[in-house]
Interface confidence: medium
């Protein structure tokens, strides 16, 4: 009897080991299939969106990541209130599960656009480093389904990089002109979005609770039109201490005014940054590591 019990234990352990190995193989197969599908990404092929089949709809990139897809690339998502799915770049590095809402990399896209374009989104949803704005409507759908953290990755022309991170990033609805709400700051680039670099300047420098403005829809706190002067759509105040949709300049101080890609607390108003990625992920994101 004793021998029989020991044999049972040994067999159970073996079964558990085999189950674990099968799971690992499944994950590996999934990743290999992904890699196979994403080979087109850098070639800029039309069909670069990774087709996950119709097994389920994902509300954001964190769900995709936690379902075992660990390769960065374009995926289709459908936030809870969104009437349709749309493509988005998922950054599966940096802890994974990041939904990229904006990217600036080379000046290939025109960001001096009107209200409708910023509302619906525009840009290159094909190439890995393509520039785009996901769309204010989509930002609203995304950020109302749960509490999100916004991470902004910034790089300058001297090969330096910094980041700013905000808890509880929310974008209002159309009725509220896609108003910006941000929570607690952390990071290395300084708090330009909340204007928390001087107690006396918040009234004009903060982007907190600012409505979105474009050249054809002016909701800023300025006598003039910030979006027109700065040639971009953004949550302008009077006018900005951050503007990541500004004009792309191919050098650090080539701007003749402050209309470049600006993060004041890092490089001031007159330095236009080389690259920016704005990405979001649920506050309580926990990677599902198999």
């Amino acid at each position: 009897l004793e021998d029989c019990a020991q044999e049972q234990m040994r067999l159970r352990a073996q079964v558990r080991l085999l189950e674990t190995r099968v799971k690992q193989q499944q994950v590996k197969i999934k990743q290999l299939l992904q890699e196979n599908e994403v080979q087109f990404l850098d070639k800029g092929d039309e069909n670069t969106v990774i087709d996950l089949g119709s097994k389920r709809q994902y509300a954001d990139c964190s769900e995709i990541f936690n379902d075992g897809y660990k390769l960065s690339g374009f995926y289709k998502i459908k936030p809870l209130q969104s009437p349709a799915e749309f493509s988005v770049y998922c950054d599966m590095s940096d802890g994974g599960g990041w939904t990229v809402i904006q990217r600036r990399s080379d000046g290939s896209e025109n960001f001096n656009r009107g209200w409708k374009d910023y509302e619906n989104g525009f840009g290159n949803f094909v190439q890995k480093h393509g520039e785009y704005w996901l769309g204010n409507k989509n930002l609203h759908f995304l950020t109302t389904q749960e509490d999100y953290t916004l991470k902004i990755d910034l790089a300058d022309f001297e090969k330096n990089s910094r980041y700013a991170q905000y808890k509880n990033f929310k974008v209002g609805d159309e009725k509220n002109f896609y108003e910006l709400n941000i929570g607690e700051y952390s990071g290395t680039a300084g708090d330009s979005l909340a204007g928390n670099f001087h107690p006396e300047v918040q009234w004009w420098a903060s982007h907190q609770r600012m409505k979105f403005s474009t050249w054809d829809r002016d909701h800023d706190n300025y006598e003039g039109n910030c979006a027109e002067e700065d040639q971009s759509g953004w949550w302008f105040n009077r006018c900005h201490s951050a503007n990541l949709n500004g004009v792309y300049y191919s050098g650090p101080y080539t701007a003749k005014t402050d209309n470049g890609i600006v993060w004041y607390t890092w490089h001031g108003w007159w330095y236009s940054l080389k690259s920016v990625v704005m990405k979001i992920r649920p506050n309580d994101f926990i990677p599902n590591v198999i």
């Epitope: 928390n196 001087h198 107690p199 009077r238 004041y264 001031g268 007159w270």
Partner: antibody, heavy 120, light 113 residues
Framework: EVQLVESGGGVVQPGRSLRLSCAAS????????MHWVRQAPGKGLEWVAL????????YYADSVKGRFTISRDNSKNTLYLQMNSLRAEDTAVYYC?????????????WGQGTLVTVSS | EIVMTQSPDSLAVSLGERATINCKSS????????????LAWYQQKPGQPPKLLIY???TRESGVPDRFSGSGSGTDFTLTISSLQAEDVAVYYC?????????FGGGTKVEIK
């Protein structure tokens, strides 16, 4: 090398006006907020006024509000202080000073100053 | 407005000795959002404009000798010259840049004993 050179000081009667200038060189003038700070003979420092990099924001000390106007011409790299209704207590050396920037209002470069004497 | 009070008004210290200047603000100049003290120290020699020594209460300006150091937080601050040199004879001012109007302390004159 950063240089700030004030001019326009002199002796003026109470109630009259004077315009000070500060010529800036050696840095991108249009990128920085600028200040005027004054120092009465044998006394301490008193901040007078501040203007933002683009001229859109101006702040003044209560003692000069309504009488002094700070302005700038970025195309000429020049800062100005228009002083009206001058009083004896405005007698001082007036310094223009560059703001360090990046969310701070302290002064990293100062001019040599220009003396304004208000006397009848 | 924030009133800055410096003490002592004047100070005589032997060469090589430590000089300590105090500065007190009527309200805190520590900004909780970034945990920084909005306070600077300047040195002014006779017939010259002031020169920036310290900002953010304790950060030394580049080119300033390391015998100068700043400390303190909230409302109480100190400028220390660890080993007084002849060229340090000057008037020293603290300045708050937490709020408008920007204000200076009355100055402390440092002389050699």
């Amino acid at each position: 090398e950063v240089q700030l050179v004030e001019s326009g000081g002199g002796v003026v009667q109470p109630g009259r006006s004077l315009r000070l200038s500060c010529a800036a060189s050696g840095f991108t003038f249009s990128s920085y907020a600028m200040h005027w700070v004054r120092q009465a003979p044998g006394k301490g420092l008193e901040w007078v006024a501040l203007i933002s990099y683009d001229g859109s924001l101006k702040y003044y000390a209560d003692s000069v509000k309504g009488r002094f106007t700070i302005s700038r011409d970025n195309s000429k790299n020049t800062l100005y202080l228009q002083m009206n209704s001058l009083r004896a207590e405005d007698t001082a050396v007036y310094y223009c000073a560059r703001d360090r920037g990046y969310g701070s209002w302290y002064f990293d470069y100062w001019g040599q100053g220009t003396l304004v004497t208000v006397s009848s | 407005e924030i009133v800055m009070t410096q003490s002592p008004d004047s100070l005589a210290v032997s060469l090589g000795e430590r000089a300590t200047i105090n500065c007190k603000s009527s309200q805190s100049v520590l900004y909780s959002s970034n945990n920084k003290n909005y306070l600077a120290w300047y040195q002014q020699k006779p017939g010259q404009p002031p020169k920036l020594l310290i900002y953010w209460a304790s950060t030394r300006e580049s080119g300033v000798p390391d015998r100068f150091s700043g400390s303190g937080s909230g409302t109480d601050f100190t400028l220390t010259i660890s080993s007084l040199q002849a060229e340090d004879v000057a008037v020293y001012y603290c300045q708050q840049y937490y709020s408008i109007p920007l204000t200076f302390g009355g100055g402390t004159k440092v002389e050699i004993k």
